[in-house]
C-alpha cells in the first residue's frame, strides 16, 4: 500500500490560530474599539486576548446624523500628532436622538509649511463664515 506521510508532531505548547471577534467600538458605532481573540490548545498558556482596533468613520456617522453641532475654529497643529482638532457643542437633537453634548474632531494638518499670505486671509474669511453656520 501507499506509505503514509509521518504525521507532524504536535508540541504540547502548540496553540491554535487566533479567532477574532468583530471590532466593537468603545463609543458610538465607529472609531476606536476592541476585539476579542480566542484560540484553542490543551497546553496553550494564553487562550484569550483583547486587541485595540478601529472602525473608520466620518464624523457625521460617528456622532449621529440626528445630532447637530456648532463648531469652533480649528485649533493649532499639534506637532507631535500632526493633527489639528476642533470642538463642537450640541445645538439640536432631532427626533429625541441621543447625542453627545460635546464632540471633538481631528484632521491631519497637512504640510507644515507657511501658506501664502493671500491664501491665508481667504481661508480665514471662509472659516469665519463657516463658523456662523450650524454644521450638520
Amino acid at each position: 500500500g501507499k506509505k503514509e506521510k509521518p504525521e507532524k508532531k504536535v508540541k504540547k505548547s502548540d496553540c491554535g490560530e487566533w479567532q477574532w471577534s468583530v471590532c466593537v467600538p468603545t463609543s458610538g458605532d465607529c472609531g476606536l474599539g476592541t476585539r476579542e481573540g480566542t484560540r484553542t490548545g490543551a497546553e496553550c498558556k494564553q487562550t484569550m486576548k483583547t486587541q485595540r482596533c478601529k472602525i473608520p468613520c466620518n464624523w457625521k456617522k460617528q456622532f449621529g446624523a440626528e445630532c447637530k453641532y456648532q463648531f469652533q475654529a480649528w485649533g493649532e497643529c499639534d506637532l507631535n500628532t500632526a493633527l489639528k482638532t476642533r470642538t463642537g457643542s450640541l445645538k439640536r437633537a432631532l427626533h429625541n436622538a441621543e447625542c453627545q453634548k460635546t464632540v471633538t474632531i481631528s484632521k491631519p494638518c497637512g504640510k507644515l509649511t507657511k501658506p501664502k499670505p493671500q491664501a491665508e486671509s481667504k481661508k480665514k474669511k471662509k472659516e469665519g463664515k463657516k463658523q456662523e453656520k450650524m454644521l450638520d
Epitope: T26, S27, Q62, F63, H95, N96, A97, C99, K101
Partner: antibody
Framework: QVQLQQSGPELVKPGASVKISCQAS????????MNWVKQRPGKGLEWIGR????????LYNGKFKGKATLTADKSSTTVYMQLSSLTSEDSAVYFC?????????????WGQGTLVTVSA | DIVMTQSPSSLAMSVGQKVTLSCRSS????????????LAWYQQKPGQSPKLLVY??IRESGVPDRFIGSGSGTDFTLTITSVQAEDLADYFC?????????FGAGTKLELK
Amino acid sequence: QVQLQQSGPELVKPGASVKISCQASGYAFSSHWMNWVKQRPGKGLEWIGRIYPGDGDSLYNGKFKGKATLTADKSSTTVYMQLSSLTSEDSAVYFCARTRAYGPAWFAYWGQGTLVTVSA
Amino acid sequence: DIVMTQSPSSLAMSVGQKVTLSCRSSQSLLDSNNQKNYLAWYQQKPGQSPKLLVYASIRESGVPDRFIGSGSGTDFTLTITSVQAEDLADYFCQQHYSTPLTFGAGTKLELK
C-alpha cells in the same frame, strides 16, 4: 463590551421610596445617555426618562415627573432611579437601557431588570 | 403622545409557518427630510430583558434573517418567514420619532 448590571429585587411598603441602580461598564459612561423603562407584569413597556451622566441633565416622560428621579455617579459609573410615594401601580420590573450609537433612541443594550414589589 | 397599537395581541403558530405582526402609530413616524422611519422592534422571551431585532427596517447584528421589518409612515410589519421554536416570545414595537418614547402593548407569539 457594554454591560448594564442592575441592583436586586426590592419589597417596599406603600407610601415609601426606593432607589434602584444600574452599573455600567465597557464604554465611555459620561457621554452616553442612560434610559429607564418600566414593565408591569403581563403589560407592555413604558419609557420613564433618561439621564446624561456627564452633566446630570435629564429628560422625563411627563407621566413620571414627580414619581421618578434620575441621578448618576461618574466615579462608580452608576445611574440611579428613585421612585417615591409608592403604590401598587409602581409594582413592576424596571430596566435601564442604552442605545448602541449616538443618534436615534432605540435600545441595543439592556440591564437584566429590577423587580420592585409594593406591598403592605 | 404617539400611541402605538399592535395586533394581534397573541397568536399560535406551528414551526415553519410564516408570521406577520402588525404595529400602527397614531401619527406618521416618517421624516420626509431624510426618509427615515423612527420605529424599532424588540423580542422579549419569558424572564428576560427585551432584545433589539430591527430598527428603521434594518436587522440588528446577529438577528437571524428570518426576521424582516417593513412598512412606512403609520403602518409597520414584523415578518418571521419561518417561525422556529426559539421564537416563542413577546414582540414589541417602539417609536422614537418624538418624546415621550412609546411602545406597543405587544404581541405574544405561542407555538401550536
